[in-house]
């Protein structure tokens, strides 16, 4: 008879057997028997197996081309697959990073709002008024108008999201 | 609680018999094999028998085999070992180990043992 | 039958101690290997299945390791509860077979 309440957690059904799954970071040879336990066998170079399992074959590492921008970050186990990040200046252009875009820069009239990393692109944001911006930049946030008052000036032409203000002297009235 | 508890143990003469008995409780008594396993004074611990959930499966090792033969009553939540034809050797604390499993009383490993009853085999 | 061979067969040690004992197998296992903890008088514990899977409550400074014929149980920071006698077993193969124990003792 099957039993009662099928097979324990790490444990597979099969032949009326309650197996052994094989540990993470090992391959399946052969089911149990009712005198034998699983036969498991760790997997190769560059492969892995990240769960209890039953596989016939474990799987490749994933390879960080760097003809696509790609670098490792972490180095695969047994255990676990390598992580791939971007070279300085890419990102990755999905969440499996299988190929990086190069940062988006910040036109001017738009400032960065979060500097990019390996995993996301750069975020800009317009320019406020009271800020600008005059440069394409990946990394150069808005900066504040200049205080013409401050420096006993007066605003000769006024500020723009892409341009500072122009101080200039105050009139002095002549006798 | 979870626990085993093993009964029936003490002295008796070479050449007879003695029945040990355990006690599941706390947990689902016929969703496991069960199994015993001894140790003689100073010596390792020993296998002796495992029967599966439903009794379908029933091992014995070497040394025991036609001696000894293991049962459960899972209305009873119980095992048990009759041990005949009993040996100055078979003297040990007998444990009654619950195997993670349900299907085999072959292989296994033992995740709840109870304290053990000592048999004593001598004239 | 599968033999099991544990050493050293007693270890003295201190609180605090790192403390390694290990089993070798006459034929490969695979990773089908636990260790037990016994105190006198007390039933056995199960502290590891599987060579290196820590049973449920069991303190992480009990660890194991190996596979194929060669299995370490490392306490990495000795405890006062932690003096017992310790065995392996194997559950490869018919019949489950153990090691013979270590004691690990007060020094």
């Known amino acids: 008879p099957e039993p009662p309440t099928a097979c324990r957690e790490k444990q597979y059904l099969i032949n009326s057997q309650c197996c052994s799954l094989c540990q993470p970071g090992q391959k399946l040879v052969s089911d149990c028997t009712e005198f034998t336990e699983t036969e498991c066998l760790p997997c190769g170079e560059s492969e892995f197996l990240d769960t209890w399992n039953r596989e016939t074959h474990c799987h490749q590492h994933k390879y960080c081309d760097p003809n696509l921008g790609l670098r490792v970050q972490q180095k695969g186990t047994s255990e676990t697959d390598t992580i791939c990040t971007c070279e300085e200046g890419w990102h990755c252009t999905s969440e499996a990073c299988e190929s990086c875009v190069l940062h988006r820069s910040c036109s001017p009239g738009f400032g960065v709002k979060q500097i990019a990393t390996g995993v996301s692109d750069t975020i800009c944001e317009p320019c406020p008024v009271g800020f600008f911006s005059n440069v394409s930049s990946a990394f150069e946030k808005c900066h504040p108008w200049t205080s013409c008052e401050t420096k006993d000036l007066v605003v000769q032409q006024a500020g723009t999201n892409k341009t500072d203000v122009v101080c200039g002297p105050q009139d002095r009235l002549r006798a | 609680e979870v626990q085993l508890v093993e009964s029936g143990g003490g002295l008796v003469q070479p050449g007879r018999s003695l029945r040990l008995s355990c006690a599941a409780s706390?947990?689902?008594?016929?969703?496991?094999?069960m199994h015993w396993v001894r140790q003689a004074p100073g010596k390792c611990l020993e296998w002796v028998s495992g029967?599966?959930?439903?009794?379908?499966?029933?091992h014995y090792a070497d040394s025991v085999k036609g001696r000894f033969t293991i049962s459960r009553d899972n209305a009873k939540n119980s095992l048990y070992l009759q041990m005949n034809s009993l040996r100055a050797e078979d003297t040990a604390v007998y444990y009654c180990a619950k195997d993670p499993t349900a299907t085999t009383g072959a292989r296994g490993y033992f995740d709840l043992w109870g304290r053990g009853t000592l048999v004593t085999v001598s004239s | 039958d599968i033999q099991m061979t544990q050493s050293p067969s007693s270890v003295s040690a201190s609180v605090g101690d790192r403390v390694t004992i290990t089993c070798r197998a006459s034929k490969v296992i695979s990773s089908w290997l636990a260790w037990y903890q016994q105190k006198p008088g007390k039933a056995p514990k199960l502290l590891i299945y599987a060579a290196s899977y820590l049973e449920s409550g069991v303190p992480s400074r009990f660890s194991g390791s190996g596979s194929g014929t060669d299995f370490t149980l490392t306490i990495s920071s000795l405890q006062p509860e932690d003096f017992a006698t310790y065995y392996c077993q194997q559950h490869s193969s018919f019949p489950p077979t153990f090691g013979c124990g270590t004691k690990v003792e007060i020094k």
């Open positions: 706390g947990f689902t008594f016929d969703d496991y094999a």
């Open positions: 029967i599966s959930w439903s009794s379908d499966s029933i």
